[in-house]
């Protein structure tokens, strides 16, 4: 398994800006994905989001999320996906094994995979931002 290069830990306000941008990009991706009619969300795919045993901003499962988005990138070249991956790169602070994700081969299953992960990713960025802002409020009280 590949490991990503070690990066310096970013200040939490930097992380918040990145997550805010990712939240916006995730909405754009989902809006475009939802243009494909007749596709239903699948129960077969789960995007890891926040880790319960870590504090913000280190609680975002960035390496796994990035791996799922890179899998979508193999299936789709919507303009926003490369930008999402670039932002996720900035949230990976230490060596992490690359998550291996099996790519669907069936046409309809590809669509379901992309819709399901895009939806979960959008929800995840909402949760991540809430966790960052609530964490920041607790730190100031």
């Amino acid at each position: 398994s590949h490991t990503l290069p070690v990066r310096l830990l970013r200040p939490s306000d930097d992380v918040q800006k990145i997550v805010e941008e990712l939240q916006s990009l995730s909405k754009m991706l989902l809006k475009d994905v939802e243009e494909e009619k007749g596709v239903l969300v699948s129960q077969n795919y789960t995007l890891p989001c926040l880790s319960p045993d870590a504090q913000p901003p280190n609680n975002i499962h960035s390496p796994a999320i990035r791996a799922y988005l890179k899998t979508i990138r193999q299936l789709d070249n919507k303009s926003v996906i490369d930008e999402i991956i670039e932002h996720l790169d900035k949230l990976i602070f230490q060596d992490a094994p690359e998550t291996n994700i099996s790519v669907p081969t069936d046409t309809h299953e590809c669509k379901r995979f992309i819709l399901t992960i895009s939806q979960q990713f959008s929800e995840c960025m909402d949760l991540a931002l809430k966790s960052l802002t609530s964490g920041a409020q607790q730190a100031t009280t």
Epitope: L29, E35, N77, S79, D82, T107
Partner: antibody, heavy 124, light 110 residues
Framework: QSQLVESGGGSVQPGGSLRLSCAAS?????????ICWVRQAPGKGLEWIVC?????????YYAPWAKGRFTISKDNSKNTVYLQMNSLRAEDTATYFC???????????????WGQGTQVTVSS | AFQLTQSPSSLSASVGDRVTITCQAS??????LAWYQQKPGKPPKLLIY???KLASGVPSRFSGSGSGTDYTLTISSLQPEDFATYYC??????????WGFGTGTKVTVK
Amino acid sequence: QSQLVESGGGSVQPGGSLRLSCAASGFSFSANYWICWVRQAPGKGLEWIVCIYIGSRADTYYAPWAKGRFTISKDNSKNTVYLQMNSLRAEDTATYFCARFSSGIYDLDRFFLWGQGTQVTVSS
Amino acid sequence: AFQLTQSPSSLSASVGDRVTITCQASQSIDSWLAWYQQKPGKPPKLLIYQASKLASGVPSRFSGSGSGTDYTLTISSLQPEDFATYYCQTYYGGGHIGWGFGTGTKVTVK
């Protein structure tokens, strides 16, 4: 039946400008593809110029040589993509095609669509 | 800058021959590769997409293979209507690659 129809070609003097149009019929602009301009000089190969994404953001990708002189834009209400060409040179003489490409690998076959092309001649 | 190198630039063959054309990308394009056939005065006709998928209505004598940076178009048994120019194209879109065409391979009668 889905088709793309190019127009706006013609003869122009060096240094002049032209605006080409690519009108979509039989389908409406949605978020599952890119529309691109490609050209072919007489007796030469296909040369990619630029693409625009049809979706939440009108992201564009230009061939390095096309940046500056060529500009792509779209009008969703008219289902039309445009190519503005400025400071035209003799070497820009070519047939200009517009083409639609899917953004996803699923159902790709139905997303590859080419127009018949419009001729541009740059000559004094 | 990203490049697609297609070879050979031309070849002469006879009806019934097996013909192979190759296309090499300067960086991985994750199978985002199409092959076209073009005849004079016409727009390109899609033969293969996603490196190996046969477009609808295209005879099964055409096949595509490859991944990463190296791709091949094969015509198993050349027919009279197959004499034309063939192009590879990437439609990866985004990143630092974008779109691009190979230089073309003209297939003529031996």
